[in-house]
């Protein structure tokens, strides 16, 4: 069965970038049914949509974090990256990696999560 | 700020039925796009809940139930069990965004 | 169309158990869920407890302990059993379709029930 | 457990009459409220959901209202073959789901 995980350095400084690779298992990221996709959720917060990434490398980002943003992904790997530049203490979050059904019968929502991994942006 | 609006919490004893309520705008729910639900239960990932305004994905059972009217959309949960405490957010699609939207996040107690 | 029809022992002795079946058509179980309903003679209805479409079940509390109920998917069956049973079990056994929005939880369609006479 | 009180447990009426079937529940139900029809030969059909929501294939002579904890059921234009029955109340605000003693219909 296909599952997700994130990985990353864990706590990242302030100004610096965030780097995290969310690597599929069990299944193939080239499917034409799926996007990929980041949310994160600031402690004791609601979840906020990152941005998402089709296997053929086509992005779509939060507006509001577009000018930080980059999601790429690697088909041959089998993963898909965020990279978000000028971190501040507010970007401190749990960051997870989901899959985005995208068939007419799958209504563009995110089906299946990554476990999450903590993100701390230290001064 | 949320483009999907939630109200904070909402509690029920054992047993009892219990709605959610999540209030868009015609450039989200208004507009046609679906409506989907999520569970999160304490320290785990969001599990999604409802697809498509009122569809379960497989293992969900039929005591939980959701709806789309107009600009908003409601989840319903059946006989409140104590598993049953999490947080829950609706999604949604927002032309004017250009992105997906989560709800403010309910959390649900049983009392 | 759908369908529910109940099976089961006309007659059961006291303390002895009962089992019942229904059997449905016309919808799957691992979308709906079935409850049981009983009615003892010219009395009114008592609702037992529900299997839902995920298997998970809800009883009615006083009743708890006294009752199973499971269900086999593939045969399109739920399973009714009832421990130590007294003459005051003595009813017509429905099981009923579970209905659910978010607006309505009712049994929208239900079998034309089972008689069981509890006596030695 | 909610308690479910239909006071009437049997009524005569004539055919044509307008007949209101009540029920009472012990506490606000919040208008989750369910009304049965089961025919003499022990058959039972949903007539009514969420207190006024007519189930599909019932006819609009039936009608139902309420709110808080009193609810009716109305049958406009009594039928004979169509109407002789016993009609039952039921909450699904709280588990368990509780029926109402039942309101049993005959014809003068």
């Known amino acids: 069965q296909l599952q997700l995980q994130e990985s990353g350095p864990g706590p990242v400084k302030s100004s610096e970038t965030l780097s995290l690779t969310c690597t599929v298992s069990g299944g193939t990221i080239g499917s034409s049914n799926y996007y990929w996709g980041w949310i994160r959720q600031p402690p004791g917060k609601g979840l906020e949509w990152i941005g998402s990434i089709y296997y053929s490398g086509g992005t779509n980002y939060n507006l509001s974090l577009k000018s930080r943003v980059t999601i790429s992904v690697d088909p041959s790997k089998n993963q898909f990256s965020l990279q978000l530049r000028s971190v501040t203490a507010a970007d401190t979050a749990v960051y997870y990696c989901a899959r985005i059904c995208s068939s007419l019968t799958s209504y563009e929502n995110f089906d299946l999560w990554g476990r999450g991994t903590l993100v701390t942006v230290s001064s | 700020q949320s483009a999907l609006t939630q109200p904070p919490s909402v509690s029920g004893a054992p047993g009892q039925r219990v709605t959610i309520s999540c209030t868009g705008s015609s450039s989200n729910i208004g507009t046609g796009y679906d409506v989907h639900w999520y569970q999160q239960l304490p320290g785990t990932a969001p599990k999604l809940l409802i697809c498509g305004n009122s569809n379960r994905p497989s293992g969900v059972p039929d005591r939980i139930s959701g709806s789309k009217s107009g600009t908003s959309a409601s989840l319903a949960i059946t006989g409140l069990q104590a598993e049953d405490e999490a947080d829950y957010y609706c999604q949604s699609y927002d032309s004017s965004l250009s992105g997906y939207v989560f709800g403010t996040g309910t959390k649900v107690t049983v009392l | 169309q759908v369908q529910l029809k109940e099976s089961g022992p006309d007659l059961v002795a006291p303390s002895q158990s009962l089992s019942i079946t229904c059997t449905v058509s016309?919808?799957?179980?691992?979308?709906?869920?079935v409850h049981w309903v009983r009615q003892p003679p010219g009395k009114g209805l008592e609702w037992l407890v529900v299997?839902?479409?995920?298997?998970?079940?809800t009883n009615n509390s006083p009743l708890k302990s006294r009752l199973s109920i499971s269900k086999d998917n593939s045969k399109s069956q739920v399973f009714l059993k009832m421990n130590s049973l007294q003459t005051d079990d003595t009813a017509m056994y429905y099981c009923a379709r579970h209905w659910g929005t978010t607006v309505v939880d009712a049994m929208d369609y239900w079998g034309q029930g089972t008689s069981v006479t509890v006596s030695s | 457990d909610i308690q479910m009180t239909q006071t009437t447990s049997s009524l005569s009426a004539s055919l044509g009459d307008r007949v209101i079937i009540s029920c009472r529940a012990s506490q606000d139900i919040r208008n989750y409220l369910n009304w049965y029809q089961q025919k003499p030969d022990g058959t039972v059909k949903l007539l009514i959901y969420?207190?006024?929501?007519l189930h599909s294939g019932v006819p609009s002579r039936f009608s139902g209202s309420g709110s808080g904890t009193d609810y009716s059921l109305t049958i406009n234009n009594l039928s004979e073959q169509e109407d002789i029955a016993t009609y039952f109340c039921?909450?699904?605000?709280?588990?368990?789901?509780?029926f109402g003693g039942g309101t049993k219909l005959e014809i003068k």
């Open positions: 016309g919808f799957s179980l691992t979308s709906y869920g």
């Open positions: 969420y207190t006024s929501q």
């Open positions: 039921q909450q699904y605000d709280t588990l368990p789901w509780t």
């Open positions: 299997i839902w479409s995920d298997g998970s079940t």
